[in-house]
């Protein structure tokens, strides 16, 4: 299934711990981009290997 | 995915009770839990939420002296505890993961 | 926080028959609006997710529309298992809130 994403809504601002929050429509959840650096489903792990 | 609520409550007012809400299928800390109020013939109300990620909590205003959130990341486990209680608190009280997931709801009674 | 105004509080119709149900937001709420069904001694079940979006297994007679403050949700050819509380859900803001229920009868 291929969904397209919105901007996350103010509920979810703080969602993604170093990136961006994108709301995944039609899996009503959201997901997020990480910055440069940061890994993890939420963006909280430091990428060591970056 | 599932949610299971801890069993109904019987208790005084004035005392307090603690739910849990543990999560099998899915790691709370991928996204908030919420906790949500049915009093007997009632609508739903919005208790608020917890990020269990970082213990990050919201409540609506009416419920911000009346309950508090709490999780436990290790036992994958949700938490409402409700103080000081009055008749008006006998509900039933369900947990929730994102929108569709929820509990089977916990009866809480409050009687003398 | 936002309010959430349903209407109507309940409603009777005819098998078969057609039911629409609306929410109207305090603000603005971008289309993040659910709607759930919800019948005695069970949880709340989502029927409709992001306004339109229907949840998988949620047959197609029943839908949702709108924006901007204005949402609703329909039902179409009404069947007995219909017979339920219907709630919104506005959940762009950092609290959520439902709307106050409709109550379905059916004549």
């Known amino acids: 299934v291929v969904s397209h994403f919105n901007d996350c809504p103010d509920s979810h601002t703080q969602f993604c711990f170093h990136g961006t929050c994108r709301f995944l429509v039609q899996e009503d959840k959201p997901a997020c981009v990480c910055a440069s650096g940061y890994v993890g489903a939420r963006c909280e792990h430091a990428d060591l290997l970056a | 995915v599932q949610l299971q609520q801890s069993g109904a409550e019987l208790v005084r007012p004035g005392a307090s009770v603690k739910l849990s809400c543990t999560a099998s299928g899915f790691n709370i800390k991928d996204d908030y839990m919420y906790w949500v109020k049915q009093r007997p013939e009632q609508g739903l109300e919005w208790i608020g939420r917890?990020?269990?990620?970082?213990?990050?909590?919201k409540y609506a205003p009416k419920f911000q002296d009346k309950a508090t959130i709490t999780a436990d990341t290790s036992s994958n486990t949700a938490y409402l505890h409700l103080s000081s209680l009055t008749s008006e608190d006998t509900a039933v009280f369900y947990c929730?993961?994102?929108?569709?997931?929820w509990g089977q709801g916990t009866l809480v009674t409050v009687s003398a | 926080d936002i309010q959430m105004t349903q209407s109507p509080s309940s409603l009777s119709a005819s098998l078969g028959g057609k039911v629409t149900i609306t929410c109207k937001a305090s603000q603005d709420i971008n289309k993040y609006i659910a709607w759930y069904q919800h019948k005695p001694g069970k949880g709340p079940r989502l029927f409709i997710h992001y306004t339109s979006k229907l949840q998988p297994g949620i047959p197609s007679r029943f839908s949702g529309s709108g924006s901007g403050r204005d949402y609703s949700f329909s039902i179409s050819n009404l069947e007995p298992e219909d017979i339920a509380t219907y709630y919104c859900?506005?959940?762009?803001?950092?609290?959520?809130?439902f709307g106050g229920g409709t109550k379905l009868e059916i004549k």
């Open positions: 917890i990020d269990p990620a970082n213990g990050n909590t």
């Open positions: 859900l506005q959940y762009d803001n950092l609290l959520y809130t």
């Open positions: 929730a993961y994102r929108r569709a997931y």
